[in-house]
């Protein structure tokens, strides 16, 4: 999912020494802010293809576009892993590949992409609108998961182009790693910007996007970098298996959820942003999540309607057990 930058365009400041200084002190933070938000933003793409020869056969291909090293890939169907989805395969770059029916063959295609062939008949057979999800655990980014399904009208043998799905699974490892440093930098830069409030403010060009957009500025990458705006969690649930994703019950939770830009999960107003994403409009549903680590062995409560925590299994020691090297 791509979106335009919400960084406002700056008009040239007044000439003179103070104007030059103001230009420098304002432009530099904005440039740094843009870099800060876009730097190292990984992306996961999912491609689902129905084989022409066997109508009950699917090929799922997933890839990770990021600089970190992948420590585990989990493929599930019927929803994200650990959120009602059923695990089909687990691929570790060194420890091996595990798969369960109807998965027939899981394999690494490259060091950052995998493929999975599914076949089945009867109860375990995937149907045309099943949602398939791929979760990549990587260091230092954390866990990133994307889901995809066949477009409703797709013909056998055809497939949707690989598309980055609008999903973020930022584990504590990633957040406290590079992301944490970048976030701190962003906050600091915003603080610098606020200090310049007393100076004559440059004229801002009106935003061409939704009224929500200004609130998401700090989270929006630049158009030039082509980085994806990753929502804490957004997926289309079109599974023919019983859908369990949208049954989150509010039980209260940590107050910092309020600061998450959950509005970013909603469909942008501009037509271009979703144009390349073959997501069926019917039966769609959006939920928001951020896969933070919980205490080892503990699964935190659901946090508000549509806000669900999906922790990785073994606490704050990132990438453990099947999640990778310890």
């Amino acid at each position: 999912m791509r979106t335009e930058a919400q960084v406002p365009a700056l008009q040239p400041p007044e000439p003179g020494l103070e104007g030059a200084m103001g230009h420098r002190t304002l432009v530099l933070p904005w440039v740094l802010l843009t870099l800060c938000v876009t730097a190292g933003t990984p992306e996961v793409w999912v491609q689902v293809r129905m084989e022409a020869t066997e109508l009950s056969s699917f090929t799922i291909r997933c890839g990770f576009l990021g600089s970190g090293s992948i420590s585990l890939v989990t493929v599930s169907w019927g929803g994200p892993n650990g959120a009602g989805g059923t695990t089909l395969a687990v691929l570790h770059p060194e420890r091996g590949i595990r798969q369960w029916a109807p998965a027939r063959q899981a394999r690494w295609e490259t060091q950052s992409s995998i493929s999975l062939i599914l076949e089945g008949s009867g109860a375990s057979s995937p149907c045309a609108n099943t949602t398939f999800c791929c979760k990549f655990a990587s260091f230092p980014e954390g866990s990133w998961e994307a889901c995809g399904s066949l477009p409703p009208s797709s013909d056998p043998g055809l497939s949707a182009p690989p598309t980055p799905a609008p999903i973020l699974r930022a584990d504590l490892a990633g957040i406290l790693g590079v992301s944490g440093v970048l976030l701190f930098g962003c906050v600091y830069l915003l603080h610098l910007l606020r200090r310049h409030k007393h100076r004559p403010a440059p004229r801002l060009q009106p935003s061409r996007t939704s009224p929500q957009a200004p609130r998401a500025r700090a989270w929006a990458p630049s158009q030039a970098s082509q980085a994806a705006l990753h929502v804490p969690y957004a997926t289309i649930n079109t599974s023919c298996r019983p859908a369990t994703l949208d049954t989150a019950h509010p039980h209260g939770g940590p107050s910092w959820w309020a600061s998450l830009p959950t509005h970013a999960a909603h469909r942008p107003q501009g037509p271009a942003a979703w144009a390349s994403t073959p997501i069926p409009a019917r039966g769609s549903f959006v939920s928001v999540e951020n896969g933070l680590y919980a205490q080892a062995g503990e699964r935190p409560p659901h946090t508000g309607p549509g806000l669900t925590l999906f922790p990785d299994p073994r606490g704050p020691r990132a990438m453990e057990g099947p999640l990778g090297v310890r």
Partner: antibody, heavy 114, light 113 residues
Framework: QVQLQQPGAELVKAGASVKMSCKAS????????ITWVKQRPGQGLEWIGD????????NYNEKFKNKATLTVDTSSSTAYMQLSSLTSEDSALYYC???????WGQGTTLTVSS | DIVMTQSPSSLSVSAGEKVTMSCKSS????????????LAWYQQKTGQPPKLLIY???TRESGVPDRFTGSGSGTDFTLTISSVQAEDLAVYYC?????????FGAGTKLELK
């Protein structure tokens, strides 16, 4: 800490069935698969099969397909292996292991009596 | 099924000696997509469950002493103990982690001279 608890021993008559348990604790049971391994006295290890909690389609070694049935009970975080039509050949030590074999149970010694 | 063949079946060594044991697979354990070999080594002491030593043919499991080294690719693999200690006396198994069923070798028994 992570633990896989298995009963120490099972004594069963030939021709009968036995259901062995492997109770997991110290981690999120549904996030790791369980593998079962057989070891006859003084012999090597044989991979029986594995099962992922939440996925009702275990993998089996062809050799054990008509012998072993793997199941899980997520509510009690317990994995089970049922062995049917027992013979003396089934007398062995049976281990359960988690995920990529990072944790093992102490094993259940099955003795099939005639 | 992939057949794993270990040799020798037993080794008599003195403490401090360097030891190597072999494991051959009937099919390649190399994953062409990421160029990784899916082979694991286990150590089993009497009365204990096996303990994972090496995975990915050469990566030591955390907590495993660095005197244990795994090497090899494709179908030929080796486990080396640079300086055998008394606590290393055990049976060592290699395992195909590449495809189902995940077959084990028959083991190499390490004994003291």
């Amino acid at each position: 800490q992570v633990q896989l608890q298995q009963p120490g021993a099972e004594l069963v008559k030939a021709g009968a069935s036995v259901k062995m348990s492997c109770k997991a604790s110290g981690y999120t049971f549904t996030s790791y698969w369980i593998t079962w391994v057989k070891q006859r006295p003084g012999q090597g290890l044989e991979w029986i099969g594995d099962i992922y909690p939440g996925n009702d389609s275990p993998n089996y070694n062809e050799k054990f397909k008509n012998k072993a049935t793997l199941t899980v009970d997520t509510s009690s975080s317990t994995a089970y292996m049922q062995l049917s039509s027992l013979t003396s050949e089934d007398s062995a030590l049976y281990y359960c292991a988690r995920g990529y074999y990072d944790y093992w149970g102490q094993g259940t010694t099955l003795t099939v009596s005639s | 099924d992939i057949v794993m063949t270990q040799s020798p079946s037993s080794l008599s060594v003195s403490a401090g000696e360097k030891v190597t044991m072999s494991c051959k697979s009937s099919q390649s354990l190399l994953n062409s997509g990421n160029q990784k070999n899916y082979l694991a080594w286990y150590q089993q002491k009497t009365g204990q469950p096996p303990k994972l030593l090496i995975y990915g043919a050469s990566t030591r499991e955390s907590g495993v002493p660095d005197r244990f080294t795994g090497s090899g690719s494709g179908t030929d693999f080796t486990l080396t103990i640079s300086s055998v200690q008394a606590e290393d006396l055990a049976v060592y198994y290699c395992q195909n982690d590449h495809s189902y069923p995940h077959t084990f070798g028959a083991g190499t028994k390490l004994e003291l001279k």
